[in-house]
């Protein structure tokens, strides 16, 4: 594959990499954050960065509780320069084909170009086309929300069912949950899993006369989505006198494949397209976000886009030392490759963000779960972290034990909005939530040594059980409020963190060949499940499982 974007094969070849290994040995692994605060009265001032959104709202990113000092930050920035992160970034923003294995541009950033500046792919300005799809989404969502768009019996639409998987599901699910406060007249449901339970349970609660189905599939060939879509269509027809003409009022497609959409029976006027330069996991900004626009209203959807656009502007225009996503990505590389950390925890102290870690899991792990560099050689270093998380304070009662006292380093991001959408009981709940947000980060940093434990009255064999090492790194992300603009900014922040990691590891963060093999084998096995014969074509384990399944099915 053609790769003209980087001039190194492996990150380990870069001089700053060796420098960082030495710094890790001499000071990184033994660094005491508590002592760093004592040594440098300006540490917080230097290591917290405030992002100002397009609407003037702010998000504070506090990196000061991380295992870094001035020298380490300087060496990490040197690494970013040597890896030419800014060069790759600029190539992405210019619409160049940085997805080298599929020879495609990576241009999700063009979807939130609300300034409507010219953005080119292969010599074509895509801004007008993006704008035209957004206008179509605005028009359609406003018609449906206002009741002007009616179902086949003349009733208003009350429910929207989005059928998609992966990028065509996770984004809209997460965003609609996160922005539930902004919901209006419609209920929205999401069907993703091929497990029949998912569609069956959804169809139990909706009315064919007032339901709009959105079939979300870039290719319109995704097995799970098309199977679920056909099931929905069959259910709809069976409830509506088997009249295919009714489909037009109740089915829309979010896809790039006009032929397949028409073949399915959807009027292509109700098709919302997007381009091949939009990757699935980056597609919530595109027509795939139609369910979001329907749920929270187009104006809020646009604010969501503008929040992301503001982070894009920050990422492209801010010097490296103050570049918030770049610093986030560099810290991730620091922990992953020098401390041997294998995971990254994202804990939103916000119930509305309960699907945010799942969304980031796909963003990060599908992007950077790669072993081959842009130079077509296998890496000799660790790449993509295992990202996980749950909302706090729930998480404090499950896996935080391991974060505090386990034998693994788990760099963590804590997210809180200062203003709750539900400031009930005179803000009592919000204050309790916030106190935990501050306390957890502090506890992970300061720990508790043997002397303190003994001073608190513990004796004998109990003492070591109550000791906390401290120096467990956290980044605290404090927003003013979770608004559409804030959420857009947070997602774009993590997109560019992921980009930065991938650029330093010199991997292609924009393909996903790893999902192919299982899909191919599933097709083969699917045919074998259609007959009653005993299967012997696989390994003994797979044969045994298939045959037992067939016996029990």
């Amino acid at each position: 594959s053609n790769n003209s974007f980087t001039n190194f094969k492996l990150a380990t070849e870069l001089p700053a990499w060796s420098k960082l290994q030495k710094i890790y040995e001499s000071q990184g692994k033994t660094l005491s954050v508590k002592q760093e605060f004592q040594k440098d009265a300006k540490r917080f001032e230097k290591l917290n960065k405030t992002f100002t959104n397009y609407d003037g709202s702010k998000i504070l990113f506090d990196y000061s509780k991380n295992l870094v000092n001035d020298e380490i930050i300087a060496a990490l920035i040197e690494l970013a320069k040597e890896a030419n992160v800014t060069g790759l970034r600029d190539a992405m923003f210019k619409g160049e084909h940085i997805n080298s294995t599929e020879d495609r541009a990576v241009y999700h950033v063009a979807l939130r170009n609300r300034a409507n500046k010219p953005m080119y792919v292969d010599g074509v300005n895509v801004a007008p086309e993006v704008d035209s799809v957004l206008k179509h989404m605005k028009e359609f969502s406003e018609q449906v929300r206002s009741g002007e768009w009616k179902g086949y019996t003349g009733k208003k639409i009350t429910d929207v069912v989005n059928i998609g998987i992966g990028g065509s599901d996770l984004g809209p699910v997460m965003v609609t949950e996160a922005l539930k406060h902004y919901a209006g007249v419609l209920d929205v449901h999401f069907v993703s899993n091929i497990d029949g339970t998912h569609i069956a349970e959804t169809l139990k609660v909706v009315d064919p006369e007032t339901t709009l189905f959105l079939i979300a599939s870039k290719t319109f060939t995704t097995a799970e989505t098309i199977t679920n879509a056909n099931t929905a269509k069959n259910w709809f027809l069976s409830k509506t006198g088997n009249d295919p003409s009714h489909i037009a009022k109740h089915f829309a497609a979010l896809s790039t494949n006009e032929t397949e959409v028409a073949k399915f029976g959807i009027d292509t006027k109700n098709m919302f397209g997007f381009e091949s330069w939009v990757g699935g996991r980056y597609s919530v900004w595109s027509a795939i976000g139609l369910s979001v626009a329907l749920y929270i209203g187009y104006d809020n959807f646009e604010a969501f886009l503008k929040g992301a656009e503001a982070v894009d502007n920050h990422f492209t225009q801010t010097p490296l030392e103050d570049n918030i996503p770049l610093l986030g990505g560099l810290l991730s590389v620091w922990y992953n490759n020098f401390f041997g950390a294998q995971t990254h925890l994202v804990a939103p102290f916000d119930q509305y963000l309960h699907r945010f870690p799942a969304y980031l899991q796909q963003l990060s792990m599908e992007s950077n779960g790669k072993s081959v560099t842009r130079g077509n050689v296998f890496t000799d270093y660790s790449t993509g972290s295992i990202l996980f998380g749950e909302p706090a304070t729930n998480a404090q009662h499950s896996f935080f034990q391991l974060v505090h006292q386990g034998t693994k380093l788990i760099p963590s991001d804590f997210i809180l909005a200062a203003q709750s959408h539900n400031p009930i009981e005179n803000k009592l709940h919000q204050k309790m939530l916030a106190s935990n947000f501050f306390a957890q980060a502090e506890a992970l940093m300061v720990g508790k040594d043997e002397e303190q434990v003994k001073a608190e009255g513990a004796t004998g064999g109990l003492v070591p059980h109550k000791v906390f090492s401290g120096n467990r790194p956290t980044t605290s992300i404090l927003a003013q409020k979770i608004t559409p603009a804030t959420l857009g900014a947070l997602i774009a922040y993590y997109e560019h963190v992921t980009f930065t990691e991938g650029a330093i590891w010199n991997i292609n963060s924009f393909d996903q060949w790893g999902v192919e093999l299982g899909k191919v084998l599933a097709k083969v096995i699917g045919k074998e499940l259609d007959n009653s014969s005993t299967i012997s074509t696989h390994d003994a384990s797979t044969n045994g499982l298939i045959n037992q399944f067939k016996e029990w099915m």
Partner: nanobody, 122 residues
Framework: QVQLVESGGGLVQPGGSLRLSCAAS????????MAWYRQAPGKQRELVAV???????NYADSVSGRFTISRDNAKNTVYLQMNSLKPEDTAVYYC????????????????WGQGTQVTVSS
């Protein structure tokens, strides 16, 4: 890498004294327990004395009252003052340290020195 280097061994007459020292070098966060072990020819290695980071000490019955273990945390060094030496104290003396490698981790790794020979003979 962590290195432990012992010194101070040698030949001494019964009733005499020796002071062994062991210095830890390399990159680590801190040292938890530091200890001295010994191994006489044809015998198992046995614990002689141990000193915790808090300064608390423990001795084998055979050396109690004659040997004193101490440490200098600033120098990452442990000492063994051996008085009233007996022929049965003849052995190779090994320094052992339980080291906390990283600031964030409580897990201790075990490190040994190469050993220093102590011979008590007239």
């Amino acid at each position: 890498q962590v290195q432990l280097v012992e010194s101070g061994g040698g030949l001494v007459q019964p009733g005499g004294s020796l002071r062994l020292s062991c210095a830890a070098s390399g990159s680590f966060f801190n040292i938890n327990a530091m200890a001295w072990y010994r191994q006489a020819p044809g015998k198992q290695r046995e614990l002689v004395a141990v000193i915790a980071s808090s300064g608390r000490t423990n001795y084998a019955d055979s050396v109690s009252g004659r040997f004193t273990i101490s440490r200098d945390n600033a120098k990452n060094t442990v000492y063994l003052q051996m008085n009233s030496l007996k022929p049965e104290d003849t052995a190779v003396y090994y320094c052992n340290s339980k080291i906390r490698q990283a600031s964030w981790n409580l897990v201790l790794s075990d490190h040994w020195g190469q050993g220093t020979q102590v011979t008590v003979s007239s």
